[in-house]
């Protein structure tokens, strides 16, 4: 089951996946100037058996010049009407973002692949937050969200992290990188 | 489903003392912000300050800093508000709600009445 | 400390209308801005956070736009139903501000 609606945003922070649940599409997207060639997937997914999962079909982009004068409108899977996007920026993974069952990782980059990718997440996906730049945690719990299904509607759980620009010194020992706590994790919350 | 269950009405006279409390149900009550919110007989909506029950970080609007004790116990899943001396002008419905960017659930309210 | 300012404070319309709520933050806040309904007795409701997003269960009637310093709450077609007080809330910092809340009474 698809999620409806992007992960929240929340202020100062920015949020990723570590990992990507089985079933997870991710839209093959070129950058400008760069098209899918022909007959090429729309998009990646991750699948996989009882023991390993991986990516499904490749992206691939060719040069917009090689193609001929007739304008062609890129089709779009049907899910595209809501979207997820995550800048290409230096992935916050643990060692072991992979090894849980049921997941794939970060799919590798592919030549003239867009500046933004679009996920369409499943329920049971996590994303993690993190503070910007010049902004800290107020707190070491977990900072992360979880796509739900409650009363056959899909929703996001609200992020826990409050990143602020407080100059004061920090009440707990160690600053930031407190985010990917496993303690006690929101997805405990009781659906319907 | 989750639930914020909020302690019952109160009446005090001027100068006493008082806690009320907010239990979190049906989820992880640590990995959640609770908030308080006043909202005086007729008027709007006030934030009083925020609490992580898991590691009882407080943080305080600065109308209400001194005034008001924001609190957790863990054990049993509870946030508490308390007075040390309360006055006429703390009469007022007093709501818990979870955080800590948008109040997505609300606690029913307690009504606190100070008259002597 | 951030203003929440919100027009009108009292606004008196019929079943079926359109009715728009006006809430300006006193510095611009981004799309960092929540909507609750209150009705008498009761808690506040959330309707919409970051502006625009529909929290989960709420009536697609309802809509909020905006950004910056300028925010409007929507109702496409009032319903029975509707007839409360609105708020609006800042979440730039966490320390929220509301606004002072518009009344949807009958006409």
């Known amino acids: 089951e698809l999620c409806d609606d992007d992960p929240p945003e929340i202020p100062h922070a920015t949020f990723k996946a570590m990992a990507y649940k089985e079933g997870t599409m991710l839209n093959c997207e070129c950058k400008r100037g760069f098209r899918r060639i022909k007959s090429g997937s729309l998009y990646m997914l991750c699948t996989g058996n009882s023991s390993h999962s991986s990516w499904d079909n490749q992206c691939q982009c060719t040069s917009s010049a090689t193609r001929n004068t007739t304008k062609q409108v890129t089709p779009q899977p049907e899910e595209q009407k809501e979207r997820k996007t995550t800048e290409m920026q230096s992935p916050m993974q643990p060692v072991d973002q992979a090894s849980l069952p049921g997941h794939c990782r970060e799919p590798p980059p592919w030549e003239n692949e867009a500046t933004e990718r679009i996920y369409h997440f499943v329920v049971g996906q996590m994303v993690y937050y993190q503070c910007v730049q010049g902004y800290r945690a107020l707190h070491r719990g977990p900072a992360e969200s979880v796509c739900k299904m409650t009363h056959g509607k899909t929703r996001w759980t609200q992020p826990q992290l409050i990143c602020t620009g407080e100059m004061e010194t920090s009440q707990f020992p160690g600053e930031e990188k407190p985010q990917a706590s496993p303690e006690g994790r929101p997805e405990s919350e009781t659906s319907c | 489903q989750v639930q914020l269950v909020q302690s019952g009405t109160e009446v005090k006279k001027p100068g006493e003392s008082l806690k009320i409390s907010c239990e979190g149900v049906?989820?992880?009550?640590?990995?959640?912000?609770i908030g308080w919110v006043r909202q005086m007989p007729g008027k709007g909506l006030e934030w009083m300050g925020i609490?992580?029950?898991?590691?009882?970080?407080?943080r305080y609007s600065p109308s209400f800093q001194g005034q008001v004790t924001i609190s957790a116990d863990k054990s049993i899943n509870t946030a508490y508000l308390q007075w040390s001396s309360l006055m006429a002008s703390d009469t007022a419905m007093y709501y818990c709600?979870?955080?800590?960017?948008?109040?997505?659930?609300w606690g029913q309210g307690t009504l606190v009445t100070v008259s002597s | 400390d951030i203003q929440m300012t919100q027009s009108p404070s009292t606004l008196s319309a019929s079943v079926g209308d359109r009715v728009t709520i006006t809430c300006r933050a006193s510095q611009s806040i981004s799309t960092w801005l929540a909507w609750y309904q209150q009705k008498p007795g009761k808690a506040p409701k959330l309707l919409i956070y970051k502006a625009s997003s529909l929290e989960s269960g709420v009536p697609s009637r309802f809509s909020g736009s905006g950004s910056g310093t300028e925010f409007t709450l929507t109702i496409s077609s009032l319903q029975p139903d509707d007839f409360a007080a609105y708020y609006c809330q800042q979440y730039s910092s966490y320390s929220w501000t509301f606004g002072q809340g518009t009344k949807v009474e009958i006409k």
């Open positions: 049906g989820y992880s009550f640590t990995t959640y912000w």
């Open positions: 609490i992580y029950p898991g590691d009882s970080i407080t």
């Open positions: 709600v979870r955080g800590p960017h948008w109040g997505d659930y």
